[in-house]
């Protein structure tokens, strides 16, 4: 899987959304979860409604709410008002009894409020090394990872 | 501000069939779920079923079975329920509720009396 | 089915007074629970969802809690406009289901 790369800056609510092929994950609930650690566990944050035919409800864990076109084939998840500790690699996945095949990874990436003079130390981005200039960009504000590029921080 | 304006009241013989409509104003009607809950007089909330305009695709619960029918129009923002094989025990308000958001049964219409009397 | 009980079947309160409305379900319905209210002559009104977000418009004094098979509907000081009947719903699982009700009746 290709790493997808979903920017918003702090503060602000980021939308990411997961395409899927909906006849594939018919009936199949979806969930949002963050990826520990390069070989951890993916720990779910939020997952979509018990009820497969009432996917389309926004349910919500805390700031993130998550919601499935199930006809679409498009997982849409929100994160409200985007902190610097929401910046990492994310997962979405189908699931189907207590497997779970992941649509989509997704690296979100917390940007610095410009109107916020306070000091943005503590935002993560990858590196300037790690150029952007070829990225694939979906819409504004996300793009497919490099080829090289580290989906993690840089661990001290 | 989405609003769910229900048909008026009705009165039916026993063995008949009641068709009541709900018809949706604000919001997109065919993305979320229209459920029919019933209340007879003196008694508790009951639901019926939950239609899926988007889909068609309906659900109802195991009592009403083969006896009611959900169907939604999309071309004019209403859905519709219809009871058939009336009992004097189908005596009761039906309401019909729509999901906004968060949960099925975010807005209500005002409530449909049927009275099933011989 | 799931089926929801609720208790006390009645409350007897005055004005500025707490309540505590609870509901219990036969089955773990994690957090798919929802109160409504409910006046004479009126429709429901949702209250709270998924067990403990208050809808919009509804006043703080409103809060939900609880998870599992334990749930509980406090009005932290009650108006006169809260006397009326309220309902818990679930629907994490079909059919839905709701409790039978508590009436918050004037002392």
């Known amino acids: 899987h290709n790493t997808t790369v979903f920017q918003g800056v702090a503060g602000q609510s980021l939308q990411v959304s997961c395409p899927y092929d909906s006849m594939k994950h018919w009936g199949r609930r979806k969930a949002w979860c963050r990826q520990l650690g390069e070989k951890g566990p993916c720990q779910r944050v939020v997952s979509t409604h018990n009820l497969w035919l009432l996917s389309f409800l926004r349910r919500w864990n805390g700031s993130t709410a998550i919601t499935d076109d199930t006809l679409g084939g498009t997982l849409t998840i929100t994160l409200r008002n985007l902190q610097p500790h929401d910046a990492g690699l994310y997962q979405c996945q189908s699931l189907h009894g207590s497997e779970a095949d992941t649509l989509r990874k997704v690296l979100v990436e917390v940007l610095a409020d410009p109107l916020d003079h306070r000091d943005a130390g503590d935002l993560w981005f990858p590196g300037e090394s790690e150029s952007f200039e070829d990225a694939h960009v979906e819409h504004s504000i996300s793009r497919s990872l490099l080829e090289g590029e580290i989906p993690f921080p840089p661990t001290s | 501000q989405v609003q769910l304006v229900q048909s008026g009241a009705e009165v039916k013989k026993p063995g008949s069939s009641v068709k009541v409509s709900c018809k949706a104003s604000g919001g997109t009607f065919a993305q979320y779920a229209i459920s029919w809950v019933r209340q007879a007089p003196g008694q508790g909330l009951e639901w019926m079923g939950v239609?899926?305009?988007?889909?068609?695709?309906?659900n109802y619960a195991q009592k009403f079975q083969g006896r009611v029918t959900i169907t939604a129009d999309e071309s004019t923002s209403t859905a519709y329920m219809e009871l058939s094989s009336l009992r004097s025990e189908d005596t009761a308000v039906y309401y019909c509720?729509?999901?906004?958001?968060?949960?099925?049964?975010?807005?209500w219409g005002q409530g449909t009396m049927v009275t099933v009397s011989s | 089915e799931i089926v929801l009980t609720q208790s006390p079947a009645t409350l007897s309160l005055s004005p500025g007074e707490r309540a505590t409305l609870s509901c219990r379900a036969s089955?773990?319905?994690?957090?798919?629970l929802a109160w409504f209210q409910q006046k004479p002559g009126q429709a429901p009104r949702l209250l709270i969802y998924?067990?403990?977000n208050r809808a919009t418009g509804i006043p703080a004094r409103f809060s939900g809690s609880g998870s599992g098979t334990d749930f509980t509907l406090t009005i932290s000081s009650l108006e006169p406009e809260d006397f009326a009947v309220y309902y818990c719903q679930q629907d994490y699982e079909w059919p839905i289901t709701f409790g039978g009700g508590t009436k918050v009746e004037i002392k």
């Open positions: 509720a729509r999901t906004q958001e968060n949960t099925i049964f975010d807005i």
């Open positions: 239609i899926i305009p988007d889909s068609g695709t309906a």
């Open positions: 998924d067990a403990s």
């Open positions: 089955q773990s319905v994690s957090s798919y």
